[in-house]
Amino acid sequence: GSERTCCPVNWVEHERSCYWFSRSGKAWADADNYCRLEDAHLVVVTSWEEQKFVQHHIGPVNTWMGLHDQNGPWKWVDGTDYETGFKNWRPEQPDDWYGHGLGGGEDCAHFTDDGRWNDDVCQRPYRWVCETELDKASQEPPLL
């Protein structure tokens, strides 16, 4: 495949990545699938600088990111190491709260109204952010 050198229409370029910001809500798994179908992934936050960029674009709205612990350990969807990576949890979070009454705890991470992170029930219909890296091989065939 060819290398992607510029962002698709309606995506925002920042630091060699492209970002797409939803304006509707989906459950985490559906948001994750949406990004994958766009040859992208839910946003993976690797620095304070990237955190500020995303926060600026989403505003004070609950928004899914590509971090979950649905199988036990916290994992970023692109394989970035959680343990050594950037974290921006709200105080007292993550708390795997069971009191919501929906069954199970809270396994998916989202940006809260102040940008810091919280874990929540993955079925909640929050907005989401997709990310894809420039210079990575595209799934599309090259133009001849």
Epitope: G72, P91, G103
Partner: antibody, heavy 115, light 107 residues
Framework: EVQLVESGGGLVKPGGSLRLSCAAS????????MNWVRQAPGKGLEWVSS????????YYADSVKGRFTISRDNAKNSLYLQMNSLRAEDTAVYYC????????WGQGTLVTVSS | DIQMTQSPSSLSASVGDRVTITCRAS??????LGWYQQKPGKAPKRLIY???SLQNGVPSRFSGSGSGTEFTLTISSLQPEDFATYYC?????????FGPGTKVDVK
């Protein structure tokens, strides 16, 4: 590599107290809820208590409520179980385990309550 | 509280056999259930989480299925190292509850 190591078990008389510890390593301890599970000799597994990552939420089995206290020290990557008013039926191997889905377990520590 | 029952409580099988263990919940727990293997004198080990997802490093001969109130653990071809006791666990709501266990021994 995730590791959980329990300690503090031993022989104690009925009515006595014991404090179990679980030393955690290989993961960001404060990001995970933790649990105590026990197994009486020759019996099945019994969930005892859980605590969320920042100690906001704490849960106990009815069989230990009011007698056992779960706590954690995230600075020391350690989980604790303070056991008071011990009874013969508390005799068991006590395991610590990570998260609600119990993905990693320690090797266990034996608590024997006998006169 | 949610009660978990397991059947059978024990079974005898031979290497190569297909083994199925059933776990039932007293109320619906979606897919919030795990399966654990325990050998004598050892800590339990997670095999399956979320009813059907295989734990990393666990052989593919183990599989889980089910949702709601009825769940199964299947070992497609029993190996010598699989003789052990198997427990299900619901972590849908507190108090968490284990099934009573199924002991798989040599026929």
């Amino acid at each position: 590599e995730v590791q959980l190591v329990e300690s503090g078990g031993g022989l104690v008389k009925p009515g006595g107290s014991l404090r179990l510890s679980c030393a955690a390593s290989g993961f960001t301890f404060s990001s995970y809820s933790m649990n105590w599970v026990r197994q009486a000799p020759g019996k099945g597994l019994e969930w005892v208590s859980s605590i969320s990552g920042s100690s906001t939420y704490i849960y106990y089995a009815d069989s230990v409520k009011g007698r056992f206290t779960i706590s954690r020290d995230n600075a020391k990557n350690s989980l604790y179980l303070q056991m008071n008013s011990l009874r013969a039926e508390d005799t068991a191997v006590y395991y610590c385990a990570r998260v609600a889905a119990f993905d990693y377990w320690g090797q266990g520590t034996l608590v024997t309550v006998s006169s | 509280d949610i009660q978990m029952t397991q059947s059978p409580s024990s079974l005898s099988a031979s290497v190569g056999d297909r083994v199925t263990i059933t776990c039932r919940a007293s109320q619906g727990i979606r897919d919030i259930l795990g399966w654990y293997q325990q050998k004598p004198g050892k800590a339990p080990k997670r095999l399956i989480y979320a009813a059907s997802s295989l734990q990393n490093g666990v052989p593919s001969r183990f599989s889980g299925s089910g949702s709601g109130t009825e769940f199964t653990l299947t070992i497609s071809s029993l190996q010598p190292e699989d003789f052990a006791t198997y427990y299900c666990l619901q972590y849908h709501s507190y108090p968490f509850t284990f099934g009573p266990g199924t002991k798989v021994d040599v026929k």
